[in-house]
């Protein structure tokens, strides 16, 4: 016996109670493929969620987070509160990064400043709560007579042109 359900297109469900007739999905539900015996209830973007894409008879709604929140998880399954740069979200809310750490985004955790000396470099620009340190050349590179892969252009002396 041929399964008539395979003839039911997306946007419908195959109603076994009615000799496998294809019935349209009711409002706020959808079926994204043909041959389905049920329709899926549409996702509702409420509270901290806002609708990015309306539900249709063949596709689910898609949600974003309202201002001040950002999406987490697959298909924006959760919204997490934004913090300022230089902060991280804790159970007690947004807290400033501890000294020696930074966060340059509105989400995520504070991360330790780069340790320039591990790469044999020196700190060119100090770190802040919002920005990582900037590492510069190693102290040895800055000492007179140190060889460099790209030697600096000679400094001009007053009244002299470079050789």
């Amino acid at each position: 016996l041929q399964d008539l359900c395979s003839n039911c297109p997306a946007g419908t469900f195959c109603d076994n109670n009615r000799s496998q007739i294809c019935s349209p999905c009711p409002p706020n539900s959808f079926s994204s493929a043909g041959g389905q015996r049920t329709c899926d209830i549409c996702r509702q973007c409420k509270g901290v969620f806002k609708t990015r894409k309306e539900c249709s008879s063949t596709s689910n709604a898609e949600c974003d987070c309202i201002s001040g929140y950002h999406c987490l998880g697959a298909e924006c399954s959760m919204c997490e509160q934004d913090c300022k740069q230089g902060q991280e979200l804790t159970k007690k809310g947004c807290k400033d990064c501890c000294f020696g750490t930074f966060n340059d985004q509105k989400r995520g955790i504070c991360r330790p400043w780069t340790n320039c000396s591990l790469d044999g470099k020196s700190v060119l620009v100090n770190g802040t709560k919002e920005r990582d340190v900037v590492c510069g050349p190693s102290p040895a590179d800055l000492s007179p007579g140190a060889s460099s892969a790209t030697p600096p252009a000679p400094a001009r002396e007053p009244g002299h042109s470079p050789q």
């Epitope: 076994n16 009711p26 209830i41």
Partner: nanobody, 120 residues
Framework: EVQLVESGGGLVQPGGSLRLSCAAS????????VGWFRQAPGKEREYVGT??????HYGDFENNRFTISRDNAKNTVYLQMNNLRPEDTAVYYC???????????????QGQGTQVTVSS
């Protein structure tokens, strides 16, 4: 934790009517289709119907004797049963799912059930 509580069951004479209620706590019905099932002693569980977004779908046995409706304000779904017959005697369960209809679906949550007995 979602809890579904059925009420309104009891003993009724053949030809009589009952209205069963299903109330949800811990979550509203807003995001769920609500279904009714029944199970008679020694028999398989039987699909009664599903309600979603103003639409109701019914099992093939009920012949327009049963009607499912919903009161949004009370967060309650009803099963109105008219012209009851002895073969309608069963425990009636309310359930919720993200699928419509629930004829072929295992519900996400189900209540404890309410007994309906049709007898003279």
């Amino acid at each position: 934790e979602v809890q579904l509580v059925e009420s309104g069951g009891g003993l009724v004479q053949p030809g009589g009517s009952l209205r069963l209620s299903c109330a949800a706590s811990g979550r509203t019905f807003d995001n769920y289709a609500v279904g009714w099932f029944r199970q008679a002693p020694g028999k398989e569980r039987e699909y009664v119907g599903t309600y979603w977004s103003g639409y109701a779908h019914y099992g093939d046995f009920e012949n327009n004797r049963f009607t499912i409706s919903r009161d949004n304000a009370k967060n309650t779904v009803y099963l109105q049963m008219n012209n009851l017959r002895p073969e309608d005697t069963a425990v009636y369960y309310c359930a919720i799912s993200l699928k419509y209809p629930m004829a072929t679906v295992t519900p996400d949550y189900q209540g404890q059930g309410t007994q309906v007995t049709v007898s003279s």
